[in-house]
Amino acid sequence: QPPPPPPDATCHQVRSFFQRLQPGLKWVPETPVPGSDLQVCLPKGPTCCSRKMEEKYQLTARLNMEQLLQSASMELKFLIIQNAAVFQEAFEIVVRHAKNYTNAMFKNNYPSLTPQAFEFVGEFFTDVSLYILGSDINVDDMVNELFDSLFPVIYTQLMNPGLPDSALDINECLRGARRDLKVFGNFPKLIMTQVSKSLQVTRIFLQALNLGIEVINTTDHLKFSKDCGRMLTRMWYCSYCQGLMMVKPCGGYCNVVMQGCMAGVVEIDKYWREYILSLEELVNGMYRIYDMENVLLGLFSTIHDSIQYVQKNAGKLTTTIGKLCAHSQQRQYR
Amino acid sequence: SAYYPEDLFIDKKVLKVAHVEHEETLSSRRRELIQKLKSFISFYSALPGYICSHSPVAENDTLCWNGQELVERYSQKAARNGMKNQFNLHELKMKGPEPVVSQIIDKLKHINQLLRTMSMPKGRVLDKNLDEEGFESGDCGDDEDECIGGSGDGMIKVKNQLRFLAELAYDLDVDDAPGNSQQATPKDNEISTFHNLGNVH
């Protein structure tokens, strides 16, 4: 470290160091002045600082503070941003796999239902993806729509293959009958429960991660108050006015200043702690029907079982539906 | 009984079931994230101290600056004098947080409430309750295994969850330290749908 400089009667030292912050020398006194106009670096005697220099010091101090805050949160911010992206993509891939499993199940077990089934399955899983990303879709409606669309195809292709498949009139009747007669048993309800619970939890998990990013971004880009700027200037730059270029602030003093500057930010602490603990609780509960990976990747099996249920009761159903939708069928055959 | 879906696969491989215990699942990945987040639980309360430790502070010097003058590092003046004649620090604290901070606190309160609601066991319908509704098929036992595949002879059980996603192993600019990646080695009649994602730090 350089030896302590001799007393500076000319402000040469201060002028030189001020150029680091502001090119040119017009704001720096040639020789020490009383400094009665100073508001932050209040002098005990003559000073080498001017009001303009003080303003520049304050601006720099606040920028320093913003940089310190950003570097403090960099690791945390990276952790959440990275994971939010990873989980979002992972969930999309789970949905894609679940759709592929379901399509494969139809292709392998019920080839006569494709390609219509592919279309309905595709729409269902598109809605699932949109829901996870925050779209305002009702899960029960999604599931109902899937079964409402599937049943006419199952009826006309599996249960009653003699019917032409362009039967729009009967399709409407069959859609209605599907719910009234509970043709799929309790399977739609099972799927509703599992899908809605697992997707709700997934959606809120992603929402929580994205809010985490927003919290860090907000505190990262805080503009510090003028009062804080004054405190920081006093701590980091006022020593320069006395030609003390190499001194550092006292530790306890720094803590007092930072607590003053951070008073507002620190108020987040309580809610931040709660956020992490609540997120932990949510994650601990994300299993079985609260785990979308588990639920969606098993959907093809439940859908398969629901179709088997229909086939098992095909005799009864055909008779009942024959009566219920007779009017539509007659019109169609004319 | 349903065939296990095997075509229409992105990789066109026949899907079999993974029982590899060490592979990373979404669930293990979530727990790993929570553990890392918990190390930041005091982030906001620790900020003032963190910033002081990352900005110039007299550590080994005999003298330090207290905002007004050079003082001995361990003297009472070191913390006190610099605060005199500045402005009222108490007043600064009483002003309360900026509007943007208040807004973010409100959002945190809201998400915390949602998270708590979602985590409450009371509101949860367990698989068991659904069994009482009397399905004629499609029932799965209430053990740790989940049923995948139709009921009957061909039913396949998957232990807990299918594993992490092969397609997601994109480069994440993360540590490549040895031992970080837990890539599975599928045995005969096992393929892993999900592979390791790379560790996010």
């Epitope: 160091f17 680091r20 912050l21 720099t60 920028l63 320093n64 940089q67 310190l68 570097s71 980091w236 730059y237 270029m245 190499m246 550092k248 | 900005s55 110039p56």
Partner: nanobody, 118 residues
């Protein structure tokens, strides 16, 4: 343990050139701005030049502008000061300094002496 070690000083004739180096260790070099500061015999400290962490921005005192060039090699953790058209008034001990914050120095080297004389 932060260490800054300057080298490259010596005796040079007016109008001549010298290149000072500063080898840094003990911190993430590329994350910090660095400065050169000098002290002429019997005089106070004088800030000479600064460079941002990435090396993208440079700053000079009026007294050396156009004659001195600051640069850094982050892969080698080294700071440089190329001094051309040297004058007698450039005679000083040259220190390299780590900037903890803009214009706030927390670590200094031990200095290297530059003497400009005919």
């Amino acid at each position: 343990q932060v260490q800054l070690v300057e080298s490259g000083g010596g005796l040079v004739q007016p109008g001549g050139s010298l290149r000072l180096s500063c080898a840094a260790s003990g911190f993430t070099f590329s994350s910090y701005a660095m400065s050169w500061v000098r002290q002429a015999p019997g005089k106070g400290l004088e800030w000479v030049s600064a460079i941002s962490g990435s090396g993208g921005s440079t700053y000079y005192a009026d007294s050396v502008k156009g004659r001195f060039t600051i640069s850094r090699d982050n892969s080698k953790n080294t700071l440089y000061l190329q001094m051309n058209s040297l004058r007698a008034e450039d005679t000083a001990v040259y220190y390299c300094a780590k900037e903890a914050l803009t214009g706030v120095f927390d670590y200094w080297g031990q200095g290297t002496t530059v003497t400009v004389s005919s």
